[in-house]
């Protein structure tokens, strides 16, 4: 799986919440960022994430689709120079400072159940998705026999009207 261009085909800001409407929030603690899954109070502001979409070519010998086997990869950046990374050894999702070109661990294959309900599959570990475990984000293995609609790996994207990236 190779990214076909160094520039994203589109980017937009959105807030990220779980299928059960808990918010994904990011807090700077001891010079590193922590990721939380929590209920927000009624008027509390949701954290925004910059989603960058990249086209990725699936190797034609694997897909049988020739040049046509394309998928969408996404990177998620809640604040400048920091991106969500898959730590496949620890089965964890972490926020790391990175420079471009980003490492493969920062890319996730996008799946969606509808336009604003999505799942993120680790590029470096197919079949493993960002999910919610004990009020934290974690990497969760989804058997191919299971339906991807399993709620703990589904996230909602809600639009934001702010066009800056904090």
């Amino acid at each position: 799986m190779s990214i076909t261009g160094i520039s994203p085909i589109t980017e937009y800001l959105a807030s990220l919440s779980t299928y059960n409407d808990q918010s994904i929030t990011f807090a700077l603690e001891d010079e590193s960022y922590e990721i939380y899954v929590e209920d927000l109070k009624k008027d509390e502001k949701k954290d925004k994430v910059l989603l960058s979409y990249y086209e990725s070519q699936h190797p034609s010998n694997e897909s049988g689709d020739g040049v046509d086997g394309k998928m969408l990869m996404v990177t998620l950046s809640p604040t400048k120079d920091f991106w969500l990374h898959a730590n496949n050894k620890e089965h964890s999702v972490e926020l790391h400072k990175s420079e471009k070109p980003l490492p493969d661990q920062a890319f996730f294959v996008l799946h969606n159940m509808h336009s604003n309900s999505v799942s993120f599959e680790s590029k470096t570990d197919p079949g493993v998705f960002i999910g919610v475990k004990d009020n934290h984000l974690a990497l969760i293995k989804v058997d191919s026999s299971e339906n991807l609609s399993t709620e703990n790996i589904l996230f909602k994207l809600s639009e934001t009207h702010h066009h800056h990236h904090h």
Partner: antibody, heavy 121, light 106 residues
Framework: EVQLVETGGGLVQPGRSLKLSCVAS????????MYWIRQAPGMGLEWVSS????????YYLDSVKGRFTISRNNAENTVYLQMNSLRSEDTATYYC??????????????WGQGTLVTVSS | DIQMTQSPSVLSASVGDRVTLSCKAS??????LDWYQQKVGEAPKLLIY???NLQTGIPSRFSGSGSGTDYTLTISSLQPEDVATYFC????????FGQGTKVEIK
């Protein structure tokens, strides 16, 4: 080469049923969302229904909900549209289309040539 | 539901002209917008996806732009083979087509 071939259209009386089929070839069918889009004579395009790659999620235009059912058979590379309780306003060319990317509901990258459904007594 | 409004309904221009088609969404659609071309008697064809990305095999005289609720398809130099109806389409929330703009040669 990607190909989508629709069949099953024809003349049908109001209230009756019809089942459209779309056979796909030239790509890994089970990786893509599939869609039905229709176009009444001389009119614009109207999205009708969507089904995700594993068939677990389906979506419908409000005016066809409860009457139309989209389904797919990934082993046979085929997507279906079962149309019940047909009305004169369902008269249209029905196109089958394939998503642009694996696993996502974004864009209709490939279209069939369409099959005409005429609902008339 | 998101409504998509295209203007003008019909556009008549000369060969070589720069042509601009407009599409307005009832809500912010986050650049989740395509443009399709449909010639008489043919199935529609994807021209532009995600607002400004040219589909493989489409001539570079076609380009797209926009954000939020306002989007544009531009044909930099109109050719006789561009005579068609052009539809915008959003997939940010559900799936909705605009009513189309018919492009004719003067």
């Amino acid at each position: 080469e990607v190909q989508l071939v629709e069949t099953g259209g024809g003349l049908v009386q109001p209230g009756r049923s019809l089942k459209l089929s779309c056979v796909a070839s030239g790509f890994t069918f089970s990786n893509y969302w599939m869609y039905w889009i229709r176009q009444a004579p001389g009119m614009g395009l109207e999205w009708v229904s969507s089904i995700n790659n594993d068939g677990g999620n389906t979506y419908y235009l409000d005016s066809v909900k409860g009457r139309f059912t989209i389904s797919r058979n990934n082993a046979e590379n085929t997507v279906y549209l079962q149309m019940n309780s047909l009305r004169s306003e369902d008269t249209a060319t029905y196109y089958c289309a394939r998503g642009h990317y694996y696993y996502t509901s974004y864009s209709f990258a490939y279209w069939g040539q369409g099959t005409l459904v005429t609902v008339s007594s | 539901d998101i409504q998509m409004t295209q203007s003008p309904s019909v556009l008549s221009a000369s060969v070589g002209d720069r042509v601009t088609l407009s599409c307005k969404a009832s809500h912010n659609i986050n650049k989740h917008l395509d443009w399709y071309q449909q010639k008489v008697g043919e199935a529609p064809k994807l021209l532009i996806y995600f607002t400004n990305n040219l589909q493989t095999g489409i001539p570079s005289r076609f380009s797209g732009s926009g954000s939020g609720t306002d989007y544009t398809l531009t044909i930099s130099s109109l050719q006789p083979e561009d005579v068609a109806t052009y539809f915008c389409f959003q997939y940010n929330s559900g799936w909705t087509f605009g009513q189309g703009t018919k492009v004719e040669i003067k």
